[in-house]
């Protein structure tokens, strides 16, 4: 059994999240994940899910009673989602830490917008896919 | 020329983001995007970038002078990043709107954590990759 399982059970106790009533009114993440089978679609959704957990864990970083559990889970997320690639993890964290209310950040984001948009679709990266998409776009 | 280009130029004027000094101290997104060639890695990063822009645009939704530009760009993001798939866009928006300070959301997130973790690595989806990874993990 992966070590994260024991630590996640510990977090369930701490957050009082083991009760069946927690599942009322549907799921947060599991239902959405079930909708997407393509790896790239899954990564779009998982990226948001992982950043949610990182934010959640950050809010409880000073709570000693769950620190070991949180760090074990974060490490396993690093292994599983980022394939233990520190650069991938660091780039991800940079993106999640940008403040949307910072004026300099806003200006930079708008300054980069055209180039970001040009790279958004997979088509932008491969001529072959671009051509095949053109047929459907008229 | 894609319609978003003209509208992005309009936003550059509004945000005073056309000046060369905006590029000082490096880029927000472009440098990071340059690091990742694999489609699934790019989606991890682009997911955060797109959610940043959506948040930014939300903050300016009542500003009439840029409303048309914002709507055009959001529509083009929808086409390019979500491939005009409304369900994909809706699921994404749901994930970005969860509040990390809402106690019910916290409990649900912790309740689902074990299953989310089990699905995080591509290996979890394909037996073949899982076996090959086991060799390295001891």
């Amino acid at each position: 059994q992966d070590p994260y399982v024991k630590e996640a059970e510990n977090l369930k106790k701490y957050f009082n999240a083991g009760h069946s009533d927690v599942a009322d009114n549907g799921t947060l993440f599991l239902g959405i994940l079930k909708n997407w089978k393509e790896e790239s679609d899954r990564k779009i959704m998982q990226s948001q899910i992982v950043s949610f957990y990182f934010k959640l864990f950050k809010n409880f970083k000073d709570d000693q009673s769950i620190q070991k559990s949180v760090e074990t889970i974060k490490e396993d997320m690093n292994v599983k989602f980022f394939n233990s690639n520190k650069k991938k993890r660091d780039d991800f964290e940079k993106l999640t830490n940008y403040s949307v209310t910072d004026l300099n950040v806003q200006r930079k984001a708008i300054h980069e917008l055209i180039q970001v948009m040009a790279e958004l679709s997979p088509a932008a990266k491969t001529g072959k896919r671009k051509r095949s998409q053109m047929l459907f776009r008229g | 020329q894609d319609p978003y280009v003209k509208e992005a130029e309009n936003l550059k004027k509004y945000f005073n983001a056309g000046h060369s000094d905006v590029a000082d101290n490096g880029t927000l997104f472009l440098g990071i995007l340059k690091n990742w060639k694999e489609e699934s890695d790019r989606k991890i990063m682009q997911s955060q970038i797109v959610s940043f822009y959506f948040k930014l645009f939300k903050n300016f939704k009542d500003d009439q002078s840029i409303q048309k530009s914002v709507e055009t760009i959001k529509e083009d993001m929808n086409v390019k990043f979500f491939n005009s798939n409304k369900k994909k866009r809706d699921d994404f928006e749901k994930l970005t709107n969860y509040s990390v300070t809402d106690l019910n959301v916290q409990r649900k997130a912790i309740h689902e954590l074990i299953q989310v973790m089990a699905e995080l690595s591509p290996a979890a989806k394909t037996g073949k990759r899982k076996r090959s990874q086991m060799l390295f993990r001891g």
């Epitope: 070590p3 994260y4 690639n85 520190k86 993890r89 | 690091n35 001891g138």
Partner: antibody, heavy 124, light 111 residues
């Protein structure tokens, strides 16, 4: 001050076994991944194995063909390398090196700290 | 194979500048951090550049690291060469199975 001290090296016959140890001090050992790297006489550095800090993920160089086993004891601040079916090609200085904090809190730098190494000689 | 290829040796006079290249054979150089180590004869490897371009404290700013995506390579540059720079230099990165990979090493001789 961060310190890594390897021990357990020595002379062993082909086919024999050895267990190397690395005693760590000066940092919270249980938070950092750890590595073993070796260097044959007059040759370059060769990575041997790595292990994460809390989740027991282990990684090995393909060339080892399952003969080596990495482990750690976080209570004793120690890293180990169990080496079996040793051949003359395994003769080298074996270094222990500290990795980074894979949970991301105060992450640190991979391979920033190295021990002095312990010499393993495989000869008949 | 995820080989990192370095020149076997380089030599230059004191005060000059040298660059040691480290070319990645498979995989994209920018997607994994690159580190550089200095190893003097009989000594322990010492990190001189980490995470592509960063210098640990105590390493002089004459030493710098860079990445060139067009050649899929990393470089270590040492300016104002000094006799104490004479050593073996190793680049190091990772592969997609989270294996650590080292370059073959470059012997730097200060003439």
């Amino acid at each position: 001050e961060v310190q890594l001290v390897e021990s357990g090296g020595g002379l062993v016959k082909p086919g024999g076994s050895l267990r190397l140890s690395c005693a760590a001090s000066g940092f919270p050992f249980s938070r950092y991944s750890m590595h073993w790297v070796r260097q044959a006489p007059g040759k370059g550095l060769e990575w041997v194995s790595s292990m994460t800090s809390r989740t027991n993920h282990k990684y090995y160089a393909d060339s080892l063909k399952g003969r080596f086993l990495i482990s750690r004891d976080n209570d004793r601040d120690s890293l180990y390398l169990e080496m079996n079916s040793l051949g003359v090609e395994d003769t080298a200085i074996y270094f222990c090196a500290r990795g980074y904090d894979t949970s991301g809190s105060d992450s640190g730098v991979d391979f920033q700290y190295w021990g002095q190494g312990t010499l393993v000689t495989v000869s008949s | 194979n995820f080989m990192l290829t370095q020149p076997h040796s380089v030599s230059e006079s004191p005060g000059k500048t040298i660059t040691i290249s480290c070319t990645r054979g498979r995989g994209y150089i920018a997607s994994y951090y690159v580190q550089w180590y200095q190893q003097r004869p009989g000594g322990v490897p010492k990190i001189v550049v980490f995470e592509d371009t960063q210098r640990p404290s105590g390493v002089p700013d004459r030493i710098s690291g860079s990445i060139d995506t067009s050649t899929n390579s990393a470089s270590l540059t040492i300016s104002g060469l000094q006799t104490e720079d004479e050593a073996d230099y190793y680049c190091q990165s990772y592969d997609d199975a989270n294996h650590v990979i080292f370059g073959g090493g470059t012997k730097l001789t200060v003439l």
